[in-house]
């Protein structure tokens, strides 16, 4: 058993049929010695008396808020949560496996630039009685500070019969140099509590590997005289690291109709303009990627050909 | 501005071109190592990230873009000093900081070159003959060093009398390639920045 936060404790259980469970001793936080009784949750049934209560925790029915009282007055609470371990593996029931970029990916993180700010998100089908707490650091043995905000519900989607909820959190490395060469990864730890179930999820990454620039901005078209060719120009996104001559981007320019299966014109360039062939009912799209370290491409910025 | 290959700038451009070749060569070599050594811990997640130039050179600090010198987190240690002549320098007006930066890059390349050559000598003794260093990568390191053209003491190639542990050598190769790729990215960024300014 260990303390998650004040008056909240996590009991780690090997989860299999007829498992013996864990013996837990609860101590009432009071100077009083006599006349103390214990109850669980909203029940008025007295579970025991005395300053300490010994319980055998085997299942979710044994978890919950234990309260010690004296003469109708509440003295203190202890909330017990369960963390299940099945076949030596901690349970991952609360969050959905996003399977990208690989299986067992529960947390996904992205950074728009090298400033040390990044966003992580996760998915769940659970809508109520759900809380998250996020901690982060650079390195684990001698951790350096990363400050994370509160996790918030950022999107709701309908997937078949199920509703899916996306939560996200923003974090900022306390003293980040955009030009630094990372040797220690960022560690992100998410504590998830659903009702009386506790789970924790972790992710480890270098900022350079989670870079995904914002789409290029200010796309403009200039038809070339006596030609089907069009000069398309754009600018670096505002959120990209500066100076741009140091943090350079490379671009992919594509002309395509509405369907992915349609024919297309595609060209890659390090410049902020390109010449392409425009077709009726097609769109010109441009996306960006770090020129020197190939992490993710940005989303497309698009303008219609006409 | 876009510099045509036919008439390269007499200043930074040769170094920019060589640094692009360097990044390409080390990325290819790292990819090859990952594929060939698939049963060794050779991915970014599996290896320890070591920097053989740590406390010996200060390329990131010495080559910091002016715009980032206002960022206190970037200014931890900017006290290393180096030789100040080099053929990549665009003009006599070249600042002391730029000379310091380029000589730091030269020192990095020299250290990695020695490490890679020593390692290759060991790998050539491996009866499995599983992996060797790409001669193109070694040539590209050499070309960039020549383009930088700094006078510097030659570092003797390390020779070891004991029987090499090929497993450890291959893991060290992965560590070295990962670190060198990151440094090659920095070098490319620096050359691009200097070329633009």
């Amino acid at each position: 058993i260990w303390e998650l936060k004040k008056d909240v404790y996590v009991v780690e259980l090997d989860w299999y049929p007829d498992a013996p469970g864990e013996m837990v001793v609860l101590t009432c936080d009071t100077p009083e010695e006599d006349g103390i009784t214990w109850t669980l949750d909203q029940s008025s049934e007295v579970l025991g008396s005395g300053k300490t209560l010994t319980i055998q925790v085997k299942e979710f029915g044994d978890a919950g808020q234990y309260t010690c009282h004296k003469g109708g007055e509440v003295l203190s609470h202890s909330l017990l949560l369960l963390h299940k371990k099945e076949d030596g593996i901690w349970s991952t029931d609360i969050l959905k496996d996003q399977k990208e970029p690989k299986n067992k990916t529960f947390l996904r993180c992205e950074a728009k630039n090298y400033s040390g700010r990044f966003t992580c998100w996760w998915l769940t089908t659970i809508s109520t009685d759900l809380t998250f707490s996020v901690k982060s650091s650079r390195g684990s043995s001698d951790p350096q500070g990363v400050t994370c905000g509160a996790a918030t519900l950022s999107a709701e989607r309908v997937r078949g019969d199920n509703k899916e909820y996306e939560y996200s959190v923003e974090c900022q490395e306390d003293s980040a140099c955009p030009a630094a060469e990372e040797s220690l990864p960022i560690e992100v730890m998410v504590d998830a509590v659903h009702k009386l179930k506790y789970e924790n999820y972790t992710s480890s990454f270098f900022i350079r590997d989670i870079i995904k620039p914002d789409p290029p901005k200010n796309l403009q078209l200039k038809p070339l005289k006596n030609s089907r060719q069009v000069e398309v120009s754009w600018e670096y996104p505002d959120t990209w690291s500066t100076p741009h001559s140091y943090f350079s981007l490379t671009f992919c320019v594509q002309v395509q109709g509405k369907s992915k299966r349609e024919k297309k014109d595609r060209v890659f360039t390090d410049k902020t303009s390109a010449t392409v062939i425009c077709r009726k009912n097609a769109s010109i799209s441009v996306r960006a990627q770090d020129r020197y370290y190939s992490s993710s491409w940005s989303e497309w910025a698009s303008v219609p050909c006409s | 501005r876009n510099l045509p290959v036919a008439t390269p700038d007499p200043g930074m451009f040769p170094c920019l071109h060589h640094s692009q070749n360097l990044l390409r060569a080390v990325s290819n070599m790292l990819q090859k190592a990952r594929q060939t050594l698939e049963f060794y811990p050779c991915t970014s997640e599996e290896i320890d990230h070591e920097d053989i130039t740590k406390d010996k050179t200060s390329t990131v600090e010495a080559c910091l873009p002016l715009e980032l010198t206002k960022n206190e987190s970037c200014l931890n240690s900017r006290e290393t000093s180096f030789i100040t002549n080099g053929s990549c320098l665009a003009s006599r007006k070249t600042s002391f900081m730029m000379a310091l930066c380029l000589s730091s890059i030269y020192e990095d390349l020299k250290m990695y070159q020695v490490e890679f050559k020593t390692m290759n000598a060991k790998l050539l003794m491996d009866p499995k003959r599983q992996i060797f260093l790409d001669q193109n990568m070694l040539a590209v390191i050499d070309e960039l060093m020549q383009a930088l053209n700094f006078n510097s003491e030659t570092v003797p190639q390390k020779s070891s009398l004991e029987e090499p542990d090929f497993y450890k050598t291959k893991i060290k190769l992965c560590i070295l390639l990962h670190a060198f790729r990151i440094r090659a990215v920095t070098i490319d960024r620096v050359m691009s920045y200097l070329n633009a300014s």
Epitope: R228, Q229, T250, R261, E262, K263, K264, D265, R266, V267, F268, T269, D270, T275, I277, R279, K280 | N2, P4, V5, A6
Partner: antibody
């Protein structure tokens, strides 16, 4: 299986014209760009131009501008390349090629040898 | 027009050995570079798209690298069927242009 089948070899006199055909099978004809590339005996490849069969848009290499005409007939899934004012240096194997991507080729026809000789 | 220069023009290789062909562009073309193989009396066949993207059905011994002005086609271990002429082609701008070809011959 996508295929491009070209018309047979031709022998032409200098100053005349030649029209080579390229019939596509497998896949929708108008879903692809069609190019013509030629190769003189013992020489390298030379791009001549492309057509978008969907709308008849074309683009020609400046070297052939005014002398080459590329057309397409959607009803027969056939593209044509006509080269006029032939000279001996036009003796080459002419290939048609296609792709959903405009600027390179994933399927190339078997080639048609055009010999220009007096 | 962008001029593509291949080297060497002829490359004698022992079967089973690796081979590398270089292609240089007269100006920067990013990764807009494609490789083709042509055997005598046959049409060219696509090997690599956009400098390094492998094409389905092409053996994994063929790989491409490069960006900007310098590109390489590498055959990791030459098989008897790989003896052919190889062409690079730029798609950065029209007119599309090819290298003059590299003939890989049996040593």
């Amino acid at each position: 299986q996508v295929q491009l089948v070209q018309s047979g070899a031709e022998v032409k006199k200098p100053g005349s014209s030649v029209k080579v055909s390229c019939k596509a099978s497998g896949g929708t004809f108008s879903d692809y760009y069609l190019h013509w590339v030629r190769q003189a005996p013992g020489q390298g490849l030379e791009w001549m131009g492309w057509i978008d069969p969907e709308n008849g848009d074309t683009e020609y290499a400046p070297k052939f501008q005014g002398r080459v005409t590329i057309t397409a007939d959607e009803s027969t899934s056939t593209a044509y390349m006509e080269l006029s004012s032939l000279r001996s240096e036009d003796t080459a194997v002419y290939y048609c090629a296609r792709n959903k991507e405009l600027r390179y080729f994933d399927v190339i026809g078997q080639g048609t040898l055009v010999t220009v000789s007096s | 027009d962008i001029v593509m220069t291949q080297s060497p023009l002829s490359l004698p290789v022992t079967p089973g050995e690796p081979a590398s062909i270089s292609c240089r562009a007269s100006q920067s073309i990013s990764i807009n570079l494609h490789w083709y193989q042509q055997k005598p009396g046959q049409a060219p066949r696509q090997l690599i798209a956009f400098a390094s993207q492998s094409i389905s059905g092409v053996p994994s011994r063929f790989s491409g690298s490069g960006s900007g002005t310098d590109f390489t086609l590498t055959i990791s271990s030459l098989q008897p069927e790989d003896f052919a002429t190889y062409y690079c082609q730029q798609s950065n701008s029209f007119p599309l242009t090819f290298g003059q070809g590299t003939k890989v011959e049996i040593k």
